[in-house]
């Protein structure tokens, strides 16, 4: 039984439009327990957006966020 489990943030699907980079405040990668890989971007308006980690723009944003950390 998974009693008292903390829900893990996964992605049902991904945004189909590239988010402007200046909207992004932070990101985190979804757990390996998720059925599909995902990157969740946190926007400056505190909205969370699921993105496809295999897309080039997603990899660039993640790299840039890491460099600026």
């Amino acid at each position: 039984s998974l009693a008292a489990d903390t829900p893990t943030a996964c992605c049902f699907s991904y945004t189909s439009r590239q988010i402007p980079q200046n909207f992004i405040a932070d990101y985190f990668e979804t757990s390996s327990q998720c059925s599909k890989p995902g990157v969740i971007f946190l926007t400056k308006r505190s909205r969370q957006v699921c993105a496809d980690p295999s897309e080039e723009w997603v990899q660039k944003y993640v790299s840039d966020l890491e460099l600026s950390a």
Epitope: L2, D5, C10, S13, Y14, T15, Q48, C50
Partner: antibody
Framework: EVQLVESGGGLVQPGGSLRLSCAAS????????MHWVRQAPGKGLEWVGV???????NYNSALMSRFTISKDNSKNTVYLQMNSLRAEDTAVYYC??????????????WGQGTLVTVSS | SAEVTQPPSVSVSPGQTARITCSSN?????????ANWVQQKPGQAPVGLIG???ERPSGIPERFSGSSSGNTATLTISGAQAEDEADYYC?????????FGGGTKLTVL
């Protein structure tokens, strides 16, 4: 402000077809899933299906051979095409917005619904 | 095929705690079923209450909470109020589709 407005319901004969529309405003379909859910008179909610931002779909297996979900991102509108309609398809049909993250409410905003009546 | 079961009705006195359960015929209800709860008042469209087992959208009062343990997901309404009288539906995700329970009518006596 997020708003969902369904239209296209009405009276249709058994065996007929109908296309419902759900016009979304206050957000873009490119960042959200869109669900269709129906409710027969005096009954509970039944999930019909979903269309994802990229256009992929999943359906209630009992309905998928007759129902098709599509969308037009330029119009920010989702459609439910219903074919070979039966009396048991009589229901209020709702569209609902679906955030993509599993921890969030998966049908957070709902329209007011449109009534489909299948009768001869 | 998956079936989701809820009690048809639950009664509670104002200010008391109401619990509405949701079970699956496939076994344990886990966090991978992303249990969602929807409220529907008579003559109105449904409203999303709880998602991902226990996430509340803004505007939903804190007295509504969700949990999952073993075979059951539970919606808890702490300090039920007259305006909470409504039908409550549980929805569970099964890999590629949602299944709603039959709904529970909450009566606040």
């Amino acid at each position: 402000e997020v708003q969902l407005v369904e239209s296209g319901g009405g009276l249709v004969q058994p065996g007929g077809s109908l296309r419902l529309s759900c016009a979304a405003s206050g957000f873009s379909l490119t960042g959200y899933a869109m669900h269709w859910v129906r409710q027969a008179p005096g009954k509970g909610l039944e999930w019909v299906g979903v269309i994802w931002p990229g256009g992929g779909t999943n359906y209630n297996s009992a309905l998928m051979s007759r129902f098709t979900i599509s969308k037009d991102n330029s119009k920010n509108t989702v459609y439910l095409q219903m074919n070979s309609l039966r009396a048991e398809d009589t229901a209020v049909y709702y569209c609902a917005r679906g955030p993509l993250i599993t921890t969030e409410v998966s049908m957070d905003y709902w329209g007011q619904g449109t009534l489909v009546t299948v009768s001869s | 095929s998956a079936e989701v079961t809820q009690p048809p009705s639950v009664s509670v006195s104002p200010g008391q705690t109401a619990r509405i359960t949701c079970s699956s015929n496939t076994g344990a209800v886990t966090t991978s079923n992303y249990a969602n709860w929807v409220q529907q008042k008579p003559g109105q469209a449904p409203v999303g209450l709880i998602g991902g087992t226990n996430e509340r959208p803004s505007g939903i009062p804190e007295r509504f909470s969700g949990s999952s343990s073993g075979n059951t997901a539970t919606l808890t309404i702490s300090g039920a109020q007259a305006e909470d009288e409504a039908d409550y539906y549980c929805a569970l995700w099964y890999s590629n589709h949602w299944v709603f329970g039959g709904g529970t009518k909450l009566t606040v006596l």
